[in-house]
């Protein structure tokens, strides 16, 4: 990796846990998004692989509420509204960073956690395994 | 209100920026995900709304690499491989938290940032606006 020169204006971290523990400014900066972005609109209803959104809530985590997508069908919805089981609805997953208080109940000490969330669904051609 | 005793096991934050600046442990805990999860497999190729993954790299950000989905077509791919322009390929977007070095180049000082990323694409029925 590239060695970053120690900037004299940087906070000092001669902590025994450094560099595992860093200082983080919690005043969130919004990049490329308005304060109140429209979240993927109504795609969950209009998609050929529609999904439902389920609330995953944990008050000890930030964000406390995460909406998880669950595909409605095994197959994909055709133009006539029927489900085509020759195709598959599958979840698109992404790893996201969340904050968790650690030690618990400490007001100003946190740990980053990575969780895998389903964001929506897409329609794919199935992988067919031929038996010899 | 009930006074919460300051937990002796909590880090001390007599920092002039406290309490906007807090300590965060970067030794990331993976919850419900392996260290190297398969990223939504090869769905980007097999989807009826296929997408390309573009590498968005920024050494001042954590994670420094984020993969952005760009839908390949305006329409959706039919079983015969042709594109159906009566349907739309659209990106599924999600807001995620990242850490940005602040001040720049400081190895142990960050700011929380919210960015909007495209995770994949899904095929939707278009909204048709009828002109009176």
């Amino acid at each position: 990796g590239i060695a970053i020169p120690r900037n004299s204006g940087c906070p000092n971290s001669e902590d025994k846990n450094f560099p595992r523990t860093v200082m983080v400014n919690l005043n969130i900066h919004n990049r490329n998004t308005s304060t109140n972005p429209k979240r993927s609109s109504d795609y969950y209803n209009r998609s050929t692989s529609p999904w439902n959104l389920h609330r995953n809530e944990d008050p000890e985590r930030y964000p406390s509420v995460i909406w998880e997508a669950k595909c409605r069908h095994l197959g994909c919805v055709k133009a006539d509204g029927n489900v085509d089981y020759h195709m598959n609805s599958v979840p698109i997953q992404q790893e996201i960073l969340v904050l968790r208080r650690e030690p618990r109940h400490c007001p100003n000490s946190f740990r980053l956690e990575k969780i895998l969330v389903s964001v929506g669904c897409t329609c794919v051609t199935p992988i067919v395994h031929h038996v010899a | 209100g009930i006074a919460i005793p300051r937990n002796s096991g909590c880090p001390n934050s007599e920092d002039k920026n406290f309490p906007r600046t807090v300590m965060v442990n970067l030794n990331i805990h993976n919850r419900n995900t392996s260290t190297n999860p398969k990223r939504s497999s090869d769905y980007y190729n097999r989807s009826t709304s296929p997408w390309n993954l573009h590498r968005n790299e920024d050494p001042e950000r954590y994670p420094s690499v984020i993969w952005e989905a760009k839908c390949r077509h305006l329409g959706c791919v039919k079983a015969d491989g042709n594109v159906d322009y009566h349907m739309n390929s659209v990106p599924i977007q999600q807001e995620i938290l990242v850490l940005r070095r602040e001040p720049r180049h400081c190895p142990n000082s960050f700011r929380l940032e919210k960015i909007l990323v495209s995770v994949g694409c899904t095929c939707v029925t278009p909204i048709v606006h009828h002109v009176a």
Epitope: N27, I28, N36, P37, R55, D58, P59, R101, C106 | -
Partner: antibody, heavy 124, light 109 residues
Amino acid sequence: QVQLQQSGPGLVKPSQTLSLTCAISGDSVSSSSAAWGWIRQSPGRGLEWLGRISYRSKWYNDYAVSVKSRITINPDTSKNQFSLQLNSVTPEDTAVYYCAREVDSLYYSYFDIWGQGTLVTVSS
Amino acid sequence: DIVLTQSPATLSLSPGERATLSCRASQNVWAFYLAWYQQKPGQAPRLLIYGASNRATGVPARFSGSGSGTDFTLTISSLEPEDFATYYCTQYYSSPSLTFGQGTKVEIK
């Protein structure tokens, strides 16, 4: 811009049902980035959150524990409005009732738009 | 439920003075979900600060918020005549818990 217009009776008899409506303009009750709530204010109780509805592929309801057994908040998508029903009211339910839009972007939660308020008196 | 306790109940100050309002939670809350509102007699509350420290659209720079954990502060750097009102803090912890403080009235001395 977004506006909320409240309507409903200002006087309700004890044991009856309090019904208020909040009409939305400039946004949709089915918005996936907002929740729609009711808050009341009385001299004795101060500001008290009563409940909210939000749409995320289906309707979600959250109600304050203090009124959970008596409250219903319903959307009306055809009229782009939502309503509050509070059953079995008593004089303690006398208050100014506000409807409000709650920005619900995962990362923040706050009421940015409020209705004008409706004073509801419970009295025989 | 989490209890939010605001202090002082009343703050008597003159225009131009600095006002410091406190909001204390009965247990740790996420600063991101803490907001401050201003209310004048006969009016609905108006959003001032969200996420503990972010000014809402159109709110003058003399208003600032800070805090984390259990202790939060709203500061008005130099009081203007239109700032004399009642201020409320509120927090969202988890469904169905959304609570308001009892308010701090800022009155002209």
